[in-house]
């Protein structure tokens, strides 16, 4: 009998509010034994895969997706899904990335504290349809794997 895979979580470092031109790293986490993490983005058909998976703890693995220079086009909701043979997990909740103009004000913090979307109840059938128009992927030309070597 196949195991019931836990839903992944997604977080952003250093946070979910990123100044224009700064970097952000999405961190996807799942159980040990994950072969592939996929990062998808709402309203885009692009996505990004990595098999560069590291062990975050004895019971958890993770993958990191880095955007070196955030643009306005990178704003929006992101989510993770992972493949642990022989099947894919459910998608994570969406995590909203906000991109702000650099204000230069001394009192305005550069980023929100690190935010995440963790596992919740299994979504309804409609909410995890990766092909609905509201559910599309990444702007690949702006996205790099943090540790991925070719």
């Amino acid at each position: 009998q196949e195991e019931d895979l836990p839903r992944p979580s997604i977080s952003a470092e250093p946070g979910t509010v990123i100044p224009l031109g700064s970097h952000v790293t999405f961190v996807c986490r799942g159980p040990v034994g994950v072969q592939t993490f996929r990062l998808e983005r709402e309203s885009r058909s692009t996505y990004n895969d990595t098999e560069d998976v590291s062990q975050a703890s004895p019971s958890e693995s993770e993958a990191r997706f880095r955007i070196d220079s955030v643009s306005e086009g990178n704003a929006g909701p992101y989510r993770c899904i992972y493949y642990k043979p022989p099947k894919w997990s459910e998608q994570s909740d969406y995590l909203e990335l906000l991109v702000k103009e650099t204000s230069g004000g001394p009192d305005s913090p550069d980023t929100e504290p690190g935010s995440s979307a963790g596992p919740t109840q299994r979504p309804s059938d409609n909410s995890h349809n990766e092909h609905a128009p509201a559910s599309q992927g990444l702007k690949a030309e702006h996205l790099y794997h943090h540790h991925h070597h070719h």
Partner: antibody, heavy 116, light 111 residues
């Protein structure tokens, strides 16, 4: 990397027929596979798709008439009770790396003829 | 159900000319859209996806634009080899149907 359809042949109306799309040179688990058909002299017609995450979608006309299933290396299209209107070349196709919207990898097609 | 309406059904132009093909979706499909070229006896070939990205090996004479419900394929500096039937496809749409709807096709004749 390639996909290839097989199983097309001449059958009488009502005879179930299973077409198989076989993946070579890539890991099928990462990809969506769509089935498309083309009747002689006609345009392309979407039948349905098997997504990487295991969901299956059908064109409205195809619901109840076909069933799509997948294994680790193949995606099958079962025609439950074909009629003469189902005579066509059947294609399977795989989407490109990094984008769900475009299908760049197509098989050569397999011809299905339904005739009494 | 999602319907893709493609116009014109046929178009003729001279070598070196320009052809424009339009495709309209019955509902907003975002960027879940592609253009294909098909020649008689051959499988479809991906030209444009996303809906403005050029597929590998496709010359920049082919240009895709649009989003939402209105999409356009422009072929400039027409060559004899461009004679083919062109199809638009949306692989968006609702969960239950219409996810992979094709347009009716446009036959391009090069004079």
């Amino acid at each position: 990397q390639s996909v290839k359809e097989s199983g097309g042949r001449l059958v009488t109306p009502g005879t179930p027929l299973t077409l198989t799309c076989t993946a070579s040179g890539f890991s099928l688990y990462k990809y969506n596979i769509q089935w498309v058909r083309q009747a002689p002299g006609k345009g392309l017609e979407y039948i349905g798709a098997s997504t990487y995450a295991g969901y299956t979608y059908y064109a409205s006309w195809a619901k109840g008439r076909v069933t799509i299933s997948r294994t680790s290396t193949t995606v099958d299209l079962k025609m439950t009770s074909p009629t003469t209107e189902d005579t066509a070349t059947y294609f399977c196709a795989r989407h490109i790396d990094g984008d769900y919207s475009g299908y760049a990898l197509w098989g050569p097609g397999t011809l299905v003829t339904i005739s009494s | 159900e999602l319907v893709m309406t493609q116009t014109p059904a046929s178009v003729s132009a001279a070598v070196g000319g320009t052809v424009t093909i339009k495709c309209q979706a019955s509902q907003s499909i975002g960027t879940w859209f592609a253009w294909y070229q098909q020649k008689p006896g051959q499988s479809p070939k991906l030209l444009i996806y996303g809906p403005s990205k050029l597929a590998s090996g496709v010359p920049p004479r082919f240009k895709g634009s649009g989003s939402g419900t209105e999409f356009t394929l422009t072929i400039s500096d027409l060559e004899c080899d461009d004679a083919a039937t062109y199809y638009c496809q949306s692989n968006g749409g609702s969960i239950s149907n219409g996810w992979g709807s094709f347009g009716g096709g446009t036959e391009v004749v090069v004079k």
